[in-house]
Amino acid sequence: MAVTACQGLGFVVSLIGIAGIIAATCMDQWSTQDLYNNPVTAVFNYQGLWRSCVRESSGFTECRGYFTLLGLPAMLQAVRALMIVGIVLGAIGLLVSIFALKCIRIGSMEDSAKANMTLTSGIMFIVSGLCAIAGVSVFANMLVTNFWMSTANMYTGMGGMVQTVQTRYTFGAALFVGWVAGGLTLIGGVMMCIACRGLAPEETNYKAVSYHASGHSVAYKPGGFKASTGFGSNTKNKKIYDGGARTEDEVQSYPSKHDYV
C-alpha cells in the first residue's frame, strides 16, 4: 500500500513538475527590466527564450520572436536545448510511468516489469528535473553577469548633460517557476525510484515433500523464498516507449492589450 502511494505521489509530483517546466519554457518573463530607480515605468521590457516583449503605459504589449537561430547567444541556445531535453525526457518518463503504475493493470504484465519501468521513469524524471534546474541556473548566471556589466557601464559617456541609461535585466517569474518545477520533477523521480524497490515481487516457492513415517502421515513443507528485484535479465514483456517533442515556429505576435498600467 505504501509502495502504491509512493509511486502514485511520485507520478503526480513529476506531472506537476513537468507541467511547470513546459510553462517556464513557454513563458516570456525569463528576464525582466530592472526597475532600480523607476518602480513604475512608461515602457517595460521583458524577455523569454523565444521572444522579447515591450509593455507600454498605454496598455499595449508588443512581442517579437527571435527569428534568427545563428545570431542568438550560445548560452541562450544551450538553455533552450536543456529545457527541451528536460521536457522530452519528462514526457517519455510520464508515458512510461503511466504503464508502470501499480494501480493500473495491463494484460499480464509482471511486477518485475512494472518495477523496471518505474525505475526507468524515475531516472528520466531525475534527469529531466536536473536539465530544467541547469537550464534555469545557466540563464540566471547569464543575467547576473550581464547585470553587473551593464551596471558598470551604466553612466559611461556622461561628460555632457546627455545620459544614456542602459536597460538592466533581472530575474523574471519564469526562472522561479523553472527552479520549483525542476525541483518537483527531481523529487518525483526520487520517489519513483524508491517505489521501485518496494515494487519488486517476493516470489515464494513451496516445494512440498512427503515423508512417510510409520504410524503417522505428516507432511513437511519446508519453505524457501527467492527474492527477485526485477533488475535482472529475466524480465519478460519488455516494452520500449517512445515520446516526441513537437516544436512550433515562432510567429510575430502583434501588439495586444494588457490589463495593467
Epitope: 523607476n38 515602457v43 516583449c53 503605459s57 498605454s58 496598455g59 541609461v165 536597460t167 490589463d259
Partner: antibody
C-alpha cells in the same frame, strides 16, 4: 467615432476642490489608458498623470501628487480628475487624452477651464 | 526627469517652403527592447486641444498629411514639414513617452512670412 467629452468651465475659490469629468465614447473605455494634461494660460503642456480604467491603476507626475486624484467609473465610461486645495496657479485648461501605441495621446477632450481667482 | 529642449522658439516660413524644428532630450528615448524611440510630436492650434502627428519618433498618425515627417534617434529628433500650408500655423510640441513623468518641450511656434 472616438469622443472625449469634458465637463464645463469651473470658477472656484482658493482652498476649494473641483472635479473635472471626461466621458468617453466610440471605443472600449477599459481598453485604453486615460491621461490628464494641464495647460496654464499662454504656457506649454504639463502631464499630470494617467489611469488605467480596467483596474484603476494610476501613475502621477510627482509635482501633482496630492494635488490631483484620478478615478474612473467604468459603468458610465467616465474618467475623473479631482483637484484639491486650489490656488491661483491651478488656473488652467485641463485636458483628458486617450493613450495609444507608443504611449502617444491620440484623442483629446476639448478641455475644461478651471479658474481660481487670486 | 527627462528635459525636452525645443528649438527654435518660433519659426517663420513662406507658403510651400520647408520647415524644420528640433527637439533634444536629456536622456536617450531609445528603448532597447524594441529599438523604438519613444518621442511624440503634437500640433496645437489656438483654442484647440493638441493633435497627434507623429509617434515612435517617425510613425505618422493615420489621417496626418504626408508632408509631416519625423526623424532622429536617441536624444536628437526633428519634425519636418516639407511644404508648409496655411493650416499648419500652430505650436508644435515634442513629448518624452519613455520615462515618467512624461514631459513636453516648451514648443515651437510656426508662423507664415
Amino acid at each position: 467615432e472616438v469622443q472625449l467629452q469634458q465637463s464645463g468651465a469651473e470658477v472656484k475659490k482658493p482652498g476649494a476642490s473641483v472635479k473635472v469629468s471626461c466621458k468617453a465614447s466610440g471605443y472600449s473605455f477599459t481598453g485604453y489608458t486615460m491621461n490628464w494634461v494641464k495647460q496654464a494660460p499662454g504656457q506649454g503642456l504639463e502631464w499630470i498623470g494617467l489611469i488605467n480604467p480596467y483596474n484603476g491603476g494610476t501613475s502621477y507626475n510627482q509635482k501633482f501628487q496630492g494635488k490631483a486624484t484620478l478615478t474612473v467609473d467604468k459603468s458610465s465610461s467616465t474618467a475623473y480628475m479631482e483637484l484639491s486645495r486650489l490656488r491661483s496657479e491651478d488656473s488652467a485648461v485641463y485636458y483628458c487624452a486617450r493613450m495609444n501605441y507608443g504611449n502617444a495621446m491620440d484623442y483629446w477632450g476639448a478641455g475644461t477651464t478651471v479658474t481660481v481667482p487670486s | 526627469d527627462i528635459v525636452m529642449t525645443q528649438s527654435p522658439d518660433s519659426l517663420a516660413v513662406s507658403l510651400g517652403e520647408r520647415a524644420t524644428m528640433s527637439c533634444k532630450s536629456s536622456q536617450s528615448l531609445l528603448n532597447s527592447g524594441n529599438q523604438k524611440n519613444y518621442l511624440t510630436w503634437y500640433q496645437q492650434k489656438p483654442g484647440q486641444p493638441p493633435k497627434l502627428l507623429i509617434y515612435w519618433a517617425s510613425t505618422r498618425e493615420s489621417g496626418v498629411p504626408d508632408r509631416f515627417s519625423g526623424s532622429g534617434s536617441g536624444t536628437d529628433f526633428t519634425l519636418t514639414i516639407s511644404s508648409v500650408q496655411a493650416e499648419d500655423v500652430a505650436v508644435y510640441y515634442c513629448q518624452n513617452d519613455y520615462s515618467y513623468p512624461l514631459t513636453f518641450g516648451a514648443g515651437t511656434k510656426l508662423e507664415l512670412k
